[in-house]
Interface confidence: low
């Protein structure tokens, strides 16, 4: 029920090395890059996935920042520091001793500084807005069908509790999926919205993280939903701290 016992693989994370030498001879899988053991019955944390990705060829990406408090991942890929439970450490530094603070999805939320920079706590990203533009279709999708299909996707593929999918908005050709999860709402064992959003983002790009599964085949009443652009906005429980220079 965790790492697949028959051939010892990790169904939820193909960026792992697995061997049958865990407790009781069970299949145990470790993330590439960090070597940390992962629970293959659920999604692997974004931090460990980014770390694993950095042990493979790099391909940076750029997004744009739309508003005052919403963050997007403008900095592209970096090799993150993860804590023993796989979460991002609040302070990240590169090899040239440039440091910055990140939120729970690993996105920078302060200006860059030096090793004296303090990041007192890992600030939780409690609201994620996934903005999609779909390719032209014969007609608009039925909103309620689209809503139901996307909620099913997050529930079944990413194991995200339905209560964390706050809304699905649709104005052809733009789809917005709102994920909300406050610290107080997230129980042990709940998939983190940041991890679900990251898996979804990689799926949409045709870079599925799931072992052996085909790519994401999204259909609404049999009609393929093909995404041509994705933007993800992150809102933190505490607003980010950037200097005025950056905001102008």
């Amino acid at each position: 029920h965790t790492a697949a016992q028959d051939n010892c693989t990790c169904p939820t994370n193909k960026m792992t090395v697995c061997s049958p030498d865990g407790p009781g001879g069970r299949c145990q899988c470790r993330a590439l890059g960090s070597g940390m053991a992962v629970d293959c019955s659920t999604l692997t944390s974004k931090c460990l996935l980014l770390k694993a990705r950095m042990s493979a060829p790099k391909n940076a990406r750029t997004l744009v920042r739309p508003s005052e408090h919403a963050l997007v991942d403008n900095d592209g890929l970096y090799d993150p520091d993860c804590d023993p439970e796989g979460r991002f450490k609040a302070r990240q530094c590169n090899q040239t001793s440039v440091c910055w603070c990140v939120n729970s999805v690993g996105v920078r939320r302060t200006d860059k500084g030096d090793l004296s920079l303090r990041c007192d706590e890992l600030v939780r990203t409690h609201h994620i807005l996934i903005d999609l533009r779909h390719r032209p279709t014969a007609g608009a999708f039925n909103h309620s069908d689209l809503d139901a299909e996307l909620r099913r996707l997050f529930r079944e593929r990413y194991r995200l509790h339905p209560k964390f999918v706050a809304a699905v908005h649709y104005e052809q050709p733009t789809i917005q999926i709102e994920l909300r999860q406050n610290t107080s709402q997230k129980a042990a064992g709940d998939v983190d919205i940041g991890d679900a959003a990251y898996y979804f983002e990689r799926d949409i790009k045709g870079e599925s993280l799931f072992q052996g599964r085909g790519g994401l085949d999204l259909r609404v009443r049999g009609e393929p939903l093909q995404v041509e652009r994705t933007l993800i906005y992150y809102l933190d429980e505490i607003p980010p701290k950037f200097s005025m220079k950056r905001l102008t």
């Epitope: 145990q28 659920t42 042990a188």
Partner: antibody, heavy 121, light 107 residues
């Protein structure tokens, strides 16, 4: 076969410290967590803490924080539990037990034979 | 901390009987519950993990069920070697916690 062998019984005076060892064999030491549980005479089981043998990071139960240290010697596949400022109520059998790393695996599939620690003046 | 409450605290039964021990968690622990058997002077032995998965080598007469807050260990037909103390444990979140134990005695 997989086994955990613990150090022998100890008799300590109040205020002293004790260090119990747990040597693992029959599996790759760094692929499983090591948990510590104690059982006072005639009582139930009480979790003290665990250590991720891969990262070396320990986690302690609140009741023991400041008094307990869990450590490793990966070269000898040995885990250690040190308990300081001993009191008479620390008299118990101390067990090491193997687990996985994540919460899905925090059950104990292999146990040491136990080490009786007696605290008496 | 999550409190695990076992019942009964003791019970008497005969060889061949069907016995059920229950464990109630003070909050939702999904299916993260394990069951152990302990005999006098010995270390506990794992019987069931993740509520219903029988550990390697454990006889099929032992079974576990439940999710959320209510869990059950069932021994379908008691054997002489089954008389012991049984503990439940939640492995959902630290601090890991055990039930107070159920002593199963010969009637």
């Amino acid at each position: 076969q997989v086994q955990l062998v613990q150090s022998g019984a100890e008799v300590k005076k109040p205020g002293a410290s004790v260090k119990v060892s747990c040597k693992a064999s029959g599996y790759t030491f760094t692929t499983a967590g090591m948990q510590w549980v104690r059982q006072a005479p005639g009582q139930g089981l009480e979790w003290m803490g665990w250590i991720n043998t891969h990262s070396g990071v320990p986690k302690y139960a609140e009741d023991f924080k400041g008094r307990v240290t869990i450590s490793l010697d990966t070269s000898t596949s040995t885990a250690y539990l040190q308990l300081s400022s001993l009191k008479s109520e620390d008299t118990a059998v101390y067990y090491c037990a193997r687990s996985g790393f994540g919460s899905s695996y925090w059950y104990f599939d292999v146990w040491g034979q136990g080490t009786l620690v007696t605290v008496s003046s | 901390d999550i409190v695990m409450t076992q019942s009964p605290s003791s019970l008497s039964a005969s060889v061949g009987d069907r016995v059920t021990i229950t464990c109630k968690a003070s909050q939702d622990v999904s299916t993260a519950v394990a069951w152990y058997q302990q005999k006098p002077g010995k270390a506990p032995k794992l019987l069931i993990y993740s509520a219903s998965y029988r550990y390697t080598g454990v006889p099929s007469r032992f079974s576990g069920s439940g999710s959320g807050t209510d869990f059950t260990l069932t021994i379908s037909s008691l054997q002489p070697e089954d008389f012991a103390v049984y503990y439940c444990q939640q492995h959902y979140i630290t601090p890991l916690t055990f039930g107070q134990g159920t002593k199963l005695e010969i009637k």
